[in-house]
């Protein structure tokens, strides 16, 4: 069965950045990476960036930069302007769409006593979607 | 709960111009759909597909508005447009927005999958 792998990773140089790395574990390829925090795609969640292998990516704010790390794996970079970090309690969602056979959604947070510069374990919660 | 909201329609002479908007919005949220369209219904027809436009910008356009229409969207203000150039009396009609998501972000055959709609705006081309 496909899964869906979350990082989130605070960087040690500069507390207010946080990159999220996803990956996607699984046979077939993919056609649509969809990053958004706050809950999953279309489920309460805010699109933070749209990655497609051929016609690119979009992104939006605090969202900085993303990109694609391999064929199946993608980070993106964001820049808290706030003095709070807020995006420290947030929940970040990756969904891998392999169309046409479905997509795959995980999410991830940074962990309450993460020192800055480590990672979160990947911790795959499968989210079976079949759009 | 996702909502639409048209706006710009309105009485316009053969020939002439408008422009509509519509912004999608919801609550709690920030809603960014994939596919973004715009559909018609002409007085006792049926429904039709005008244009719609993907999150990458990719376009598709019915054959009756080609280079008369344009469609666009501002993704930052979750806003899509359709300037409509050189109308004419067929072109009077109910247009509606309609929004959606897809497996691979692109627009979907015109009609197919999109699951959010606005309630409309009067077009209306008569001299």
């Known amino acids: 069965t496909p899964e869906v792998w979350v990082q989130v990773q605070m960087e040690a140089t500069e507390l207010s950045s946080f990159t999220v790395h996803c990956g996607f574990l699984g046979p077939g390829s993919i056609s649509l990476v969809t990053v958004s925090w706050g809950g999953p795609d279309g489920a309460g969640g805010t699109k933070l960036a749209v990655l497609h292998p051929e016609l690119g990516t979009r992104q939006w704010a605090p969202a900085r930069q993303a990109r694609w790390e391999t064929q199946s794996s993608i980070s993106l970079a964001l820049e808290d302007s706030g003095a709070s970090s807020p995006f420290a309690n947030t929940t970040f969602c990756c969904k891998f769409a392999s169309f046409p056979e479905g997509s795959w959604e995980s999410c991830g947070s940074l962990p309450p006593s993460s020192d800055p510069g480590l990672s979160a374990p990947p911790t795959p919660v499968p989210i079976l979607r079949a759009d | 709960e996702v909502q639409l909201v048209e706006s710009g329609g309105g009485l316009v002479q053969p020939g002439g111009s408008l422009r509509l908007s519509c912004v999608a919005s919801?609550?709690?949220?920030?809603?960014?759909?994939?596919?973004m369209a715009w559909f018609r219904q002409a007085p006792g027809k049926g429904l039709e597909a005008v244009a719609g436009?993907?999150?990458?910008?990719?376009?598709t356009y019915a054959d009756s508005v080609k280079g008369r229409f344009t469609i666009s969207r501002d993704n930052a203000k979750n806003s899509l447009y359709l300037q409509m150039n050189s109308l004419r009396a067929e072109d009077t009609a109910v247009y509606y927005c309609?929004?959606?998501?897809?497996?691979?972000?692109?627009?979907?055959?015109?009609?197919?999958?999109?699951?959010?709609w606005g309630q409309g705006t009067m077009v209306t081309v008569s001299s």
């Open positions: 309609a929004a959606g998501d897809s497996p691979d972000g692109r627009c979907p055959p015109l009609g197919q999958g999109l699951n959010y």
């Open positions: 919801a609550s709690g949220f920030t809603y960014r759909p994939y596919c």
């Open positions: 436009i993907d999150i990458f910008g990719g376009t």
